[in-house]
Interface confidence: medium
């Protein structure tokens, strides 16, 4: 629980690794500058939204490795008694909208399965990821626009749902879960785009950035 020092450190998302890297780079460049965290977070979030799949890739790899570490450590972790209660999840809550990548996958998964019937689920997922990464951003736009519209609808629905209120016993847990969920949406709502060029002072200049409209 909260005070259990033996509990494995929680797994970090790709975005969290990106922010950590941003902070470290900022510290290196401006060691004496004090950071306005809300402004910094906003900048990070905006930059993340415009990063290409390749740029995001290294952070996703870090997140994968951290997830593996977390799962490994959790296998041997024994929580203290009374620590196994699950957070309540209201089945009536609006479903989180699919991302542009998810919509893309829904369209292309059957095609891949049709062309390669023997592929494992993992290999199909890998192929879909590669296809998405190699899709120019202008070709991603139909999925992005549809995802944006679904997200808009979801935000209206979730606001209405919250206004109605939740079952009393569950209120506390759900609000907390949704708060962190909302933050994640803000950070990761836009899918990777293959369109932003890096400035000279940024790292990994050899990374493919190419354009094809945002």
């Amino acid at each position: 629980g909260k005070g259990d020092p033996k509990k494995p450190r929680g797994k970090m998302s790709s975005y969290a690794f990106f922010v950590q890297t941003c902070r470290e780079e900022h510290k290196k460049k401006h060691p004496d500058a004090s950071v306005n965290f809300s402004e910094f977070s906003k900048k990070c979030s905006e930059r993340w939204k415009t990063m290409s799949a390749k740029e995001k890739g290294k952070f996703e790899d870090m997140a994968k490795a951290d997830k593996a570490r977390y799962e490994r450590e959790m296998k041997t972790y024994i929580p203290p008694k009374g620590e196994t209660k699950k957070k309540f999840k209201d089945p009536n809550a609006p479903k989180r909208p699919p991302s542009a990548f998810f919509l893309f996958c829904s369209e292309y998964r059957p095609k891949i399965k049709g062309e390669h019937p023997g592929l494992s689920i993992g290999d199909v997922a890998k192929k879909l990821g590669e296809m998405w990464n190699n899709t120019a951003a202008d070709d991603k736009q139909p999925y992005e626009k549809k995802a944006a519209k679904l997200k808009e609808k979801y935000e209206k629905d979730i606001a209405a749902y919250r206004a109605k209120g939740k079952p009393d016993a569950a209120k506390k847990g759900v609000v907390k879960a949704e708060k962190s969920k909302k933050k994640k949406e803000e950070e990761e709502d836009e899918e990777d785009e293959e369109d932003e060029e890096e400035e000279e002072d940024e790292e990994d200049e050899e990374e493919e950035e190419d354009d094809d409209d945002e």
């Epitope: 900048k43 905006e46 415009t50 202008d138 139909p142 932003e196 060029e197 400035e199 940024e202």
Partner: antibody, heavy 125, light 108 residues
Amino acid sequence: AVQLVESGGGLVQPKESLKISCAASGFTFSNAAMYWVRQAPGKGLEWVARIRTKPNNYATYYADSVKGRFTISRDDSKSMVYLQMDNLKTEDTAMYYCTAPRRTEGIVSSGVDYWGQGVMVTVSS
Amino acid sequence: YELIQPPSASVTLGNTVSITCSGDELPKRYAYWYQQKPDKSIVRVIYKDSERPSGISDRFSGSSSGTTATLTISDTQAEDEADYYCHSTYSDDKLPVFGGGTKLTVLG
């Protein structure tokens, strides 16, 4: 600061050839897809050609009006993009702009794009 | 694939004007707006339907609904007199498309 500077324009006769150039600076050129856009006198803007980056095999795309006559190319080592125009027609008379459509500035996407000042190509007998 | 814009629009100084751009692919594609001043310099004023690039006045705003994208300029100034072009990407051509342009006249 980002700069795109076109050169090589001039007056040519129909069916002749001309090569215009664009020198880029202030950004990582090899990461940027590049375009040529033109504007005939008193007319609107028209996309002419596009060249992608090395990881995209320098793929090229052309407007139907110039296909088979114009060739876009680039030299990443010199941060240059070129437009070779062959078998020129009077309707190719226009101001030709070199453009790099998008950038990220520092950590924040600014949504700014960059255009050169343009170079005039006149095709007349 | 075409993007249709009215050839001209006029507005009285200080008022609001909207310029439309119609295209079958706009429900699926983002619209971008460019301003070309009489000196022929070109600046993008809106990207991704409604995003404003840094350095562009907040008097410029964009929206998109169905097959129509709209550029709105509020509290119009004399310096806003220019040609405005919408553009959108189109995957089959692998080149974007420009609208025909709208000449905006600001009346004193």
